[in-house]
């Protein structure tokens, strides 16, 4: 007996072929011998089966000896053995209909868990194998669980259900609600304008929620809320903002914040949270601000950085077009009695310059 796998809600064609390529009598029945459809003259006739209103056949193929039955909008309970009677012979086809659905909303926050549940006909023993957009493979039986979703899990999951050496493929679109980056660092010279951007890793037709940026300045003992805002249909409106610093926020997505000046007292790290309407939990993005200052005071040339820097970063003072350099894996470097000329202060990571500030040392007479 031939086995055909179908998907819930889908359409399936059960084939039945006669040896002679001509129009002949045929009919389809279910395992209870109830007629589903058949032929009477040139007319397609329907029987009393529950399937009849969803069953069809292609007249144009009858002349080719093909008397297939097409079943639309498949249901799990359509799983059955169907019998095609043609030319005094019976052809049996076993149809097994499966459904695979996400237990919750398919729009999930990063870190939340995803559960996929397989609906299957009684007596079947299918196996399921799912592949994430990032290439992660997960296997299971009636349920498949992904405990902690990551942003790279966003996209189309392809799940293959296997039964009796046959397979049927399901595609499920999962949207992981997250920012594009978990963390970002902005490097600025003192006095420069700072731009913070928080692009989302997803698009929704209607995006509504509220958010807040908490800031922990390196010099401060505790963190404080710099700004709170609302998001309504992708439009951003500021609710409350501190007086110092006076942040500005863009009215459209992506979320965009402007700090008028980078100052040492602002250097530190922040956490932007976004709570979306009808979703439990919040989206997070960490943002860091590193500020550089180069100063000359009497006979001392100093370069300092404030903010979260890794110990492997190098801070250097270098005289332009000269070999004179002082470098340290520290947050401050200085040169006593510096030569006259243009000095460069460089913050670098394995030779890659992250931030640079120039200061002119004039000769003292």
């Amino acid at each position: 007996k031939k086995v055909v796998l179908g998907k819930k809600g889908d359409t399936v064609e059960l084939t039945c072929n006669a040896s002679q390529k001509k129009n002949t009598q045929f009919h389809w029945k279910n395992s209870n011998q109830i007629k589903i459809l058949g032929i009477q003259g040139l007319f397609l006739t329907k029987g009393p089966s529950k399937l009849s209103d969803r069953a069809d056949s292609r007249k144009s193929l009858w002349d080719q000896g093909c008397f297939s039955m097409i079943i639309k909008n498949l249901k799990i309970e359509d799983s059955d053995t169907y019998i095609c009677e043609v030319e005094n012979k019976k052809e049996e086809v076993e149809l097994l209909v499966f459904g695979l659905t996400a237990n919750s909303d398919t729009h999930l926050l990063e870190g939340q868990s995803l559960t996929l549940t397989l609906e299957s006909p009684p007596g079947s023993s299918p196996s399921v194998k799912c592949r994430s957009p990032g290439g992660k493979n997960i296997q299971g039986g009636r349920t498949i669980s992904v405990p902690q979703l990551e942003r790279q899990d966003s996209g189309t999951w392809t799940c293959t259900v296997s039964q009796d050496q046959k397979t049927v493929e399901f595609k499920i679109d999962i949207v992981v609600l997250a920012f594009q980056k978990a963390s970002s660092t902005v490097y600025k010279k003192e006095g420069e304008q700072v731009e913070f951007s928080f692009p989302l890793a997803f698009t929704l037709e209607k995006l509504t929620g509220s958010g807040e940026l908490w800031w922990q300045a390196e010099r401060a003992s505790s963190s404080k809320s710099w700004i709170t805002f609302d998001l309504k249909n992708k439009e951003v409106s500021v609710k409350r903002v501190t007086q110092d610093p006076k942040l500005q926020m863009g009215k459209k997505l992506p979320l965009h914040l402007t700090l008028p000046q980078a100052l040492p007292q602002y250097a530190g790290s922040g956490n932007l949270t976004l709570a979306l309407e009808a979703k439990t939990g919040k989206l997070h993005q960490e943002v860091n601000l590193v500020v550089m200052r180069a100063t000359q005071f009497q006979e001392n040339l100093t370069c300092e950085v404030w903010g979260p820097t890794s110990p492997k970063l190098t801070l250097s003072l270098k005289l332009e077009n000269k070999g004179a350099t002082v470098s340290k894996q520290a947050k401050a470097v200085w040169v006593l009695n510096p030569e006259a000329g243009m000095w460069q202060c460089l913050l670098s990571d394995s030779g890659q310059v992250l931030l640079e500030s120039n200061i002119k040392v004039v000769p003292t007479w």
């Epitope: 998907k7 809600g9 889908d10 359409t11 399936v12 064609e13 003259g41 040139l42 007319f43 069809d56 292609r58 007249k59 144009s60 002349d63 097409i70 079943i71 639309k72």
Partner: antibody, heavy 115, light 107 residues
Framework: QVQLQQWGAGLLKPSETLSLTCAVY????????WSWIRQPPGKGLEWIGE???????NYNPSLKSRVTISVDTSENQFSLTLISVTAADTAVYYC?????????WGQGTLVTVSS | DIQMTQSPSSVSASVGDRVTITCRAS??????LAWYQQKPGKAPKLLIF???SLQSGVPSRFSGSGSGTDFTLTISSLQPDDFATYYC?????????FGQGTNLGIK
Amino acid sequence: QVQLQQWGAGLLKPSETLSLTCAVYGGSFSGYYWSWIRQPPGKGLEWIGEINHSGSTNYNPSLKSRVTISVDTSENQFSLTLISVTAADTAVYYCVRLINWFDPWGQGTLVTVSS
Amino acid sequence: DIQMTQSPSSVSASVGDRVTITCRASQDISNWLAWYQQKPGKAPKLLIFAASSLQSGVPSRFSGSGSGTDFTLTISSLQPDDFATYYCQQANSFPYTFGQGTNLGIK
């Protein structure tokens, strides 16, 4: 709601090959048949051929020697290739779903064959 | 090939009129016939299938009848939205064929 979206080159020179692709969104791909129909400007409808998800085809005998319909089930797409086109092939080409009746239809692509 | 012949080729009518379009098949096609409506610049739309079954979403003023070789599409009370070209199509055998069309215009 099933939607058919089609695309392909709109301007060809005589003897060139016409290529159109149709993508099926939001519905079942298997179990149905997928057809191409054309309509010359100001004229009636002509069925070109059909394919199912397993690649079984039927063609209009009037075009059979020049036409190929292929299917890509992984992308829920099917394509039309018509070789050695002439001005008589100028038409709006539609992709359509069917079992026995044509519904729904793609938006149509005007293909003009001109030297 | 099965030839499908529609008549009339064009007809003018007024809003509220009852309009009948006929389609004749060159051989017996039982009830394997559909009717389509097409407006300028648009794809055809299925109205009636299996000779007399109304497609979901189509107004009930449209009806189809006939069997064998002679078929009729009737619009019981013409509405402004109904001015279009109408085609019949047979699904009895390959190649599928259409009537040449009936243009329904405003009187």
